[in-house]
Amino acid sequence: ATKLTEEKYELKEGQTLDVKCDYTLEKFASSQKAWQIIRDGEMPKTLACTERPSKNSHPVQVGRIILEDYHDHGLLRVRMVNLQVEDSGLYQCVIYQPPKEPHMLFDRIRLVVTKGFSGTPGSNENSTQNVYKIPPTTTKALCPLYTSPRTVTQAPPKSTADVSTPDSEINLTNVTDIIRVPVFN
C-alpha cells in the first residue's frame, strides 16, 4: 500500500494557500485534475476540477479555488484565496483517468487556518503586499458528471456546466509566506 504522507500548511485567515501537485508528465498531462477535501467521518468531496481535457496553464476558478495545470512542468497549481478558518482540513490532488480509477497525488495537504493577529492592520512583519489578478474565465465541464461507456470523454450537458462570473477578478492583499511542514502518518 502507498504510504500516505501529509504536508502541513499553517496560514492565517485572509491568506492564500498555494500548492503545487507534481504528476508524471507524459502520462497525465492532458488528464483532468481535481482538488478534493477529506473530512473526518465524511465522504471525500471534489471541490473543483480542471477542464476536460485539461488545458495548459489555463486558470479555472470555482469560488475561492483556482486551479492551473502546467503541462510542461508536470504540475497542478492549486490556490485557495482569502482563507477562512472553516477551510481547515485535509486536501488532495486527484487525476481522473476514466474508465480507470482516479489517481491520487501525494502528499496530501493538511491545511490549518487560524484567526489573524489582532492589532494594527499590516503590522505582521511577514506579510507582503501581493495582488493576484485572475483573468475572467468561463469554465466548461468542470468535473466529470455523467460517464457511461459510450461517453467517457464527452462533456456533460450544458445545463450542468459551471460558469464563473464573467468579470470575476480576485484581488489579494497581505499574502504571507507559506509555512510547509512535512507530516508523516
Epitope: Q36, I37, G41, P44, L47, I65, P144, T147
Partner: antibody
Framework: QVQLVESGGGVVQPGRSLRLSCAAS????????MHWVRQAPGKGLEWVAV????????YYADSVKGRFTISRDNSKNTLYLQMNSLRAEDTAVYYC???????????????WGQGTLVTVSS | DIVMTQSPDSLAVSLGERATINCKSS????????????LAWYQQKPGQPPKLLIY???TRESGVPDRFSGSGSGTDFTLTISSLQAEDVAVYYC?????????FGGGTKVEIK
C-alpha cells in the same frame, strides 16, 4: 438510459435477515457513489447508507449501524444491502440511488430505483 | 446531525399560480471555498421514486422544466414553481448532502386549489 432495479424485498420476521440488491445499467457503475434510502409507509425519506465508487468508504445512519452492511460488486454492476436483526421499524420501501456526479463530485442523487418493499412483521 | 425543516407541510395553489416551499437547515450547508451549497430538491409523485429537480441549491437538473427554480444560501432555501401545472402535484423534499448523516426535510405536499 440509466436504470436501477432493486430486488430482494419481502416479508420477514423480526430478528431475521434479508439481502437487497440493486442492479445498475446504462452507466459506468464503478464511477459513482451509491446510496440506500428508505421510506416507511406514508412517511418521508430517510437516508440509510452510502458507499463510495470503489467501496473504500462506507457510512450508515445511526438507526441501522451495526445491523446493516452496504457493499458493491463493480464487476457485476450491483449494489447490496445486507440487513440483519430486522425490526418492525425497518418496514419501508428501500430505494437505491446514484450520486449525480462521479468521484465524489456530488450534490443530489440523480437516479433512483423503483424501490423494493421490506415488511418486518411477526 | 443537520436537521432540515420544511414549510409549509402542505400547500394548495391554483393552476398557473406560484408555489413557494421553504427549507431551513440547522447549520450551514455551504462550502465557502467553492461557493456551493450542498442542498438538493426532489419531487415525488404517488407510487414513484423521488426525482431530482435542483442541485447545489439553484442548479436545475437536465430535463427539468424552467418553471422550477431554487434559491438561497447557507441555511435558508426556497423552491419556487412559477406557474403550477397539474403534473406538479406531488410531495417535494429538500435534502442536504453537506455532511453525514445526509438528511431530508419532512416534505411539502403540493395540491391544486
Amino acid at each position: 438510459q440509466v436504470q436501477l432495479v432493486e430486488s430482494g424485498g419481502g416479508v420477514v420476521q423480526p430478528g431475521r435477515s434479508l439481502r437487497l440488491s440493486c442492479a445498475a445499467s446504462g452507466l459506468t457503475f464503478s464511477s459513482y457513489g451509491m446510496h440506500w434510502v428508505r421510506q416507511a409507509p406514508g412517511k418521508g425519506l430517510e437516508w440509510v447508507a452510502v458507499i463510495s465508487y470503489d467501496g473504500s468508504n462506507k457510512y450508515y445512519a445511526d438507526s441501522v449501524k451495526g445491523r446493516f452492511t452496504i457493499s458493491r460488486d463493480n464487476s457485476k454492476n450491483t449494489l447490496y444491502l445486507q440487513m440483519n436483526s430486522l425490526r418492525a421499524e425497518d418496514t419501508a420501501v428501500y430505494y437505491c440511488a446514484r450520486e449525480r456526479g462521479t468521484y465524489y463530485y456530488a450534490s443530489g442523487w440523480a437516479n433512483w430505483g423503483q424501490g423494493t418493499l421490506v415488511t418486518v412483521s411477526s | 446531525d443537520i436537521v432540515m425543516t420544511q414549510s409549509p407541510d402542505s400547500l394548495a395553489v391554483s393552476l398557473g399560480e406560484r408555489a413557494t416551499i421553504n427549507c431551513k437547515s440547522s447549520q450551514s450547508v455551504l462550502f465557502s471555498s467553492n461557493n456551493k451549497n450542498y442542498l438538493a430538491w426532489y419531487q415525488q409523485k404517488p407510487g414513484q421514486p423521488p426525482k431530482l429537480l435542483i442541485y447545489w441549491a439553484s442548479t436545475r437538473e437536465s430535463g427539468v422544466p424552467d418553471r422550477f427554480s431554487g434559491s438561497g444560501s447557507g441555511t435558508d432555501f426556497t423552491l419556487t414553481i412559477s406557474s403550477l401545472q397539474a403534473e406538479d402535484v406531488a410531495v417535494y423534499y429538500c435534502q442536504q448532502d453537506f455532511s453525514l448523516p445526509y438528511t431530508f426535510g419532512g416534505g411539502t405536499k403540493v395540491e391544486i386549489k
